[in-house]
């Protein structure tokens, strides 16, 4: 349905309070430098103009496109060339250009001071005088930290949020109250920045038939019930959000993922007996409800994959017939019988059956030919499995800490041109998969596992792809999404890799290091970890976890030491010299 | 190529019945969302009902609910629509129709033509 005016439509149909958020989101989003008050700036121009808009939608500029409306703003920034350097460059084009150019200059790790938590009683009194400026920061602080963090559930973080500081800041004990909430959902906030992250990934480097066909997995395996027609539309809706989202088309995108909701909540019979709940709650939560609802149960009665796939003599007809169609029901019918395997081993199932097809079509014989094609999913099918145990097994015997402290050492050796930050930071993440798999039961435990670390290594991919420094990486990284991980197991130690020469200043330590955070320790010795690694790539890990033990004694002799700092610079070196010589 | 072929259709008094049939081919039927798409005089086109390939689930519009019933035999590769108490209202050609996607069909046949009139 066509509008005389894009931006009157949304704000009609968003609302004021949505619409500001989302615009304030967006801007963000894209110029991640600015501060705060230019955007409440720029958001309440926008706002007013919406406004106008809604009054008479054939005021002058209401017919244009938001992307040349916000470009335009965006461009109105004094400062933009001194901040932002040739992004500025942007502005000289036409859109779509433009955004196109806008969207590239989005930086996965800007350079910005970590957010510091003032104190409980401070927060709770900037929360309770000025509540909207305060919840608005909030959206702006995350939004410029995670360029592409899925906006209309970044507003229901905010309200998260908000709910949080107005239970909390009336409590006896207000930090009691609030630090655990503030934590868990920082915690879920980078856990979600990350999942979308890779879906932004998928659609822009693999296009919108990767997106699909990793999205027809997960909603086959979530609504096992509904049939392909259901689970397509659903598909198709799912695909335009996150493209929307991910092309910065957050109002957009907003709009249509409520859309998508209110068709679920009204369509409950033919998708899934599990979506009552969600569909009871106000928006922001249905929505989120809906994206997070478990699985469906099976239906009983469902026959053999073989009579369809394998026995038909119907099969290459039908492939040849429509090649898009046909593979999309293979991978519904294969994904609803499967919730316990990785939406990636069944795209990996699906490419595998989709090249016997192309090779076996072709022959005198085809029957003859594909007649065995599912026994060859078995070492496919394996090898998701023993990860699983493997590592659950390595999680279970050292726990979290060591277990990161493993995977960190397996992937320096592996990749040791990467930067030590973002090893210790992909190595950290890829060692939280324990704590959150591995207590699953076996039947949840595949798709837990490795579709976590598809996210976790999709953020190596993208940190990486902004300095690239690893030949190794760009490779696992861009040849295949669904062969990532496998791609990463694969590889074995880099024997190319010159050692890195020593400097004595990464292995200083000083007496401010009593006074972190455990969390910031571990930080600090994981450092020095994969640093020991790039000096000493050919380091048993039996030589490394002593030297590692001699590290966390002389850090703990010296933090109960009278003089930390004298302990520090008279013990440093001698536990550098030690390290030496166990190296050897 | 796809073939949809609708039978059955004719005139008939208020309160009466029909059987409407559909034969399909050129596709594998029982993977298929099938469902009847009617188009009244001077009017667009309105889905009538639709049923899942396995049969288990069906959709009626409001307009017919309790009075059609739809069905499949997909050993026969053919749709059916039992039509009662049938209604001046319901005088539209019926096209029988096949679906990809919720909401939408990708092929439809010739239709059949009902008319209720006394």
């Known amino acids: 349905d066509a509008h005389k005016s894009e931006v009157a439509h949304r704000f009609k149909d968003l609302g004021e309070e949505h619409f500001k958020d989302l615009v304030l989101v967006a801007f963000s989003q894209y110029l991640q430098q600015c501060p705060f008050e230019e955007h409440l700036k720029l958001v309440n121009e926008v706002t007013e103009f919406a406004k106008t808009c809604v009054a008479d939608e054939t005021a002058e500029n209401c017919d244009k496109s938001l992307h040349t409306l916000f470009g335009d703003k965006l461009c109105t920034v004094a400062t933009l060339r001194e901040t932002y350097g040739d992004m500025a460059d942007c502005c000289a084009k036409q859109e779509p250009e433009r955004n196109e150019c806008f969207l590239q200059h989005k930086d996965d790790k800007p350079d910005l001071p970590p957010l510091v938590r003032p104190e409980v009683d401070v927060m709770c009194t900037a929360f309770q005088e000025h509540e909207d400026t305060f919840l608005k920061k909030y959206l702006y602080e995350v939004a410029r930290r995670h360029p592409y963090f899925y906006a209309p559930e970044l507003l229901f973080f905010a309200q998260k949020y908000k709910a949080a500081f107005t239970e909390c800041c009336q409590a006896a004990d207000k930090g009691a109250c609030l630090l655990p909430k503030l934590d868990e959902l920082r915690d879920q906030g980078k856990a979600s920045s990350a999942k979308q992250r890779l879906k932004c990934a998928s659609l822009q480097k693999f296009g919108e038939r990767a997106f699909k066909a990793w999205s027809v997995a997960r909603v086959s395996q979530r609504f096992p019930k509904a049939d392909f027609t259901e689970v397509t539309k659903v598909v198709t809706d799912l695909t335009k959000v996150h493209t929307e989202c991910c092309h910065g088309d957050l109002l957009e995108c907003a709009d249509d993922r409520a859309e998508l909701a209110k068709y679920m909540c009204e369509n409950q019979d033919s998708l899934s007996s599990k979506l009552k709940e969600c569909c009871e709650k106000p928006l922001l939560e249905k929505s989120h409800c809906l994206a997070h609802v478990e699985n469906d149960e099976m239906p009983a009665d469902l026959h053999a994959l073989t009579d369809d796939y394998v026995e038909s003599k119907d099969v290459c007809k039908n492939y040849a017939e429509a090649k898009d169609v046909f593979m999309g029901m293979f991978l519904y019918e294969y994904s609803r019988r499967h919730p316990d395997y990785s939406a990636m081993l069944l795209l990996r199932l699906a490419k595998a059956y989709e090249a016997t097809l192309e090779k076996c079509c072709a022959t005198a014989d085809p029957h003859g030919c594909y007649a065995k094609v599912f026994d060859e999913f078995q070492p496919l099918v394996e090898d998701p499995q023993n990860l699983v145990k493997h590592n659950c097994e390595l999680f279970e015997q050292f726990g979290e800490y060591k277990f990161q402290n493993e995977l960190l050492v397996r992937y320096t050796k592996k990749v040791p041109q990467v930067s030590t930050p973002t090893l210790v930071e992909v190595s950290r993440n890829l060692g939280k998969v324990g704590t959150k798999c591995c207590k699953q039961p076996e039947a949840k435990r595949m798709p837990c596992v490795e579709d976590y670390l598809s996210v976790v290594l999709n953020q190596l991919c993208v940190l990486h792809e902004k300095t690239p420094v690893s030949d190794r990486v760009t490779k696992c990284c861009t040849e295949s999404l669904v062969n990532r991980r496998p791609c990463f197991s694969a590889l074995e130690v880099d024997e190319t890799y010159l050692p890195k020469a020593f400097n004595a200043e990464t292995f200083t330590f000083h007496a401010d290091m009593c006074t972190l955070s455990e969390k910031e320790q571990q930080v600090k010795k994981q450092t020095a970890l994969a640093e020991l690694v790039k000096h000493k790539p050919k380091a048993t890990n039996e030589q490394l976890k002593t030297v590692m033990e001699d590290f966390a004694a002389f850090v703990e002799k010296c933090c109960k030491a009278d003089d930390k700092e004298a302990c520090f610079a008279e013990e440093g070196p001698k536990l550098v010299a030690a390290s030496e010589t166990a190296l050897a | 190529e796809v073939q949809l072929l609708e039978s059955g259709g004719g005139l008939v008094q208020p309160g009466g019945s029909l059987r409407l049939s559909c034969t399909a081919s050129?596709?594998?039927?029982?993977?298929?969302?099938m469902g009847w798409v009617r188009q009244a005089p001077g009017k667009g086109l309105e889905w009538v009902s639709w049923?899942?390939?396995?049969?288990?689930?069906?959709y009626y519009a409001d307009s017919v609910k309790g009075r059609f019933t739809i069905s499949r035999d997909n050993s026969k590769n053919t749709l059916y629509l039992q039509m009662n108490s049938l209604r001046a209202e319901d005088t539209a050609v019926y096209y029988c129709?096949?679906?990809?996607?919720?909401?939408?069909?990708?092929?439809w046949g010739q239709g059949t033509l009902v008319t209720v009139s006394s």
């Open positions: 129709a096949k679906s990809y996607m919720a909401g939408t069909f990708d092929y």
């Open positions: 050129g596709f594998t039927f029982r993977h298929y969302r």
């Open positions: 049923i899942r390939p396995d049969g288990t689930f069906t």
